[in-house]
């Protein structure tokens, strides 16, 4: 799998996810997020070639059609496949409150 | 949604489903399918802004973070939502045979 | 050059299975169709059933079916096929041969040759 | 199932001579979708003709076929040494795939 565990122990060029963190007022201009400050989001990243990590039989077909038409701008791309949520603490007046943001964090890629 | 009915129509720059004919033999090297000789399969292509068709909490994340950081590498990506099945005709010696392939033809791009 | 290699020779009981590798290089595995076929020791050749790996339909000489499963792992460019239920007179040298492009259709390029005996 | 019956069972030529291999259909198999093969002792089938009469990239022009409905015809125009093996017929129009029992050429 192109999980956080393979890929960021490798120097891998095809689809992997990479590390990536992003500061909460920094990044995006959040400010309500009290704690954390950021998080590892991770990202995507990596060419698709015929075989690696496809998503569906469409992917398949793609990648095939990419590897026989290499100009082609149609190609498989490489996105989040395991998301996971991160917990935060933001505060209404002066109550904090705790809260799950699902989906916030890139565990694996795929190609689709 | 960005699919067939509203991209096709348009001449939009932002990430939407655009047409692609993949010939079996000549794209893919296939000669097993008997019919259709190709298909109209589809491709995902166009920037993923902040706000356009952002599938997950995450993507909305990353794009945000790519418009607070212009030159980074991490962005969402144009990529297949909707898939449709295609029936075939195969050859077994001299008898046709139909099957459905499915996830084969894009009916719609999300960012993902 | 195209090269289809095979896993290694096997001994197996009877009322037991075997599952035989081949692994397909130098060439693209995915526009392929592969065939199995046997061959009994001293005996002709046997068609088992073929596979068209890049979308797993699969099929199987009546003779064998419900005994022989024949799939496929593109990501490793394999082919593997299974047979169950295993008995004397399925000791062979078992072949993959990847096919002129067609499910049904002459065989162009074959593996070494796996051999199974069966025997108790 | 379609039954291939190959003859002769046994060939015994000489080098340099011309072999003449027969394979007969149970039923009409149309013209294209046959093949032969060559078999040595310890190696895989080699296949020398498919389509009944197409040659097979690599194989020499001594190897041609030939027939269509139910007969079929392989033939080698001059044997040459490593001509000597086992050679197989094969129809492909009808599942399941079936070969004939084969035609051993030996050395007269």
């Known amino acids: 799998a192109l999980d956080t565990n393979y890929c960021f122990s490798s120097t891998e060029k095809n689809c992997c996810v990479r590390q990536l963190y992003i500061d909460f007022r920094k990044d995006l201009g959040w400010k309500w997020i009290h704690e954390p400050k950021g998080y590892h989001a991770n990202f995507c990243l990596g060419p698709c070639p015929y075989i690696w990590s496809l998503d569906t039989q469409y992917s398949k077909v793609l990648a095939l059609y990419n590897q026989h038409n290499p100009g082609a701008s149609a190609a498989p791309c490489c996105v989040p496949q395991a998301l996971e949520p991160l917990p935060i603490v933001y505060y209404v007046g002066r109550k904090p409150k705790v809260e799950q943001l699902s989906n916030m964090i890139v565990r694996s890629c795929k190609c689709s | 949604a960005l699919d067939t009915n509203y991209c096709f129509s348009s001449t939009e720059k932002n990430c939407c489903v655009r047409q692609l004919y993949i010939d079996f033999r000549k794209d893919l090297g296939w000669k097993w399918i008997h019919e259709p000789k190709g298909y109209h399969a589809n491709f995902c292509l166009g920037p993923c802004p902040y706000i356009w068709s952002l599938d997950t909490q995450y993507s909305k994340v990353l794009a945000l973070y790519n418009q607070h950081n212009p030159g980074a590498s991490a962005a969402p990506c144009c990529v297949p939502q909707a898939l449709e099945p295609l029936p075939i005709v195969y050859y077994v010696g001299r008898k046709p045979k139909v099957e459905q392939l499915s996830n084969m033809i894009v009916r719609s791009c999300k960012c993902s | 050059q195209v090269q289809l290699v095979q896993s290694g020779a096997e001994v197996k009981k009877p009322g037991s299975s075997v599952k035989v590798s081949c692994k397909a290089s130098?060439?693209?595995?995915?526009?392929?169709?592969i065939s199995w076929v046997r061959q009994a020791p001293g005996q002709g050749l046997e068609w088992m059933g073929g596979v068209i790996p890049i979308v797993d339909i699969a099929n199987y000489a009546q003779r064998f079916k419900g005994r022989v499963t024949i799939t496929a792992d593109e990501s490793t460019s394999t082919t593997y096929m299974e047979l169950s239920s295993l008995r004397s007179e399925d000791t062979a040298v078992y072949y993959c041969a990847s096919t002129l492009g067609l499910v049904l259709d002459a065989m162009d390029y074959w593996g070494q040759g796996t051999l199974v005996t069966v025997s108790s | 199932e379609t039954v291939l019956t190959q003859s002769p069972g046994t060939l015994s030529l000489s080098p340099g001579e011309r072999a003449t291999l027969s394979c007969r259909a149970s039923q009409s198999l149309g013209s294209s979708y046959l093949a032969w093969y060559q078999q040595k002792p310890g190696q895989a089938p080699r296949l020398l003709i498919y389509?009944?009469?197409s040659r097979a990239p690599g194989i020499p022009d001594r190897f041609s076929g030939s027939g269509s409905g139910t007969d079929f015809t392989l033939t080698i125009s001059r044997l040459e040494p490593e001509d000597f093996a086992v050679y197989y017929c094969q129809q492909y129009a009808d599942s399941p795939i079936t070969f004939g029992q084969g035609t051993r050429l030996e050395i007269k």
């Open positions: 389509g009944a009469s």
């Open positions: 130098g060439y693209t595995f995915s526009s392929d169709v």
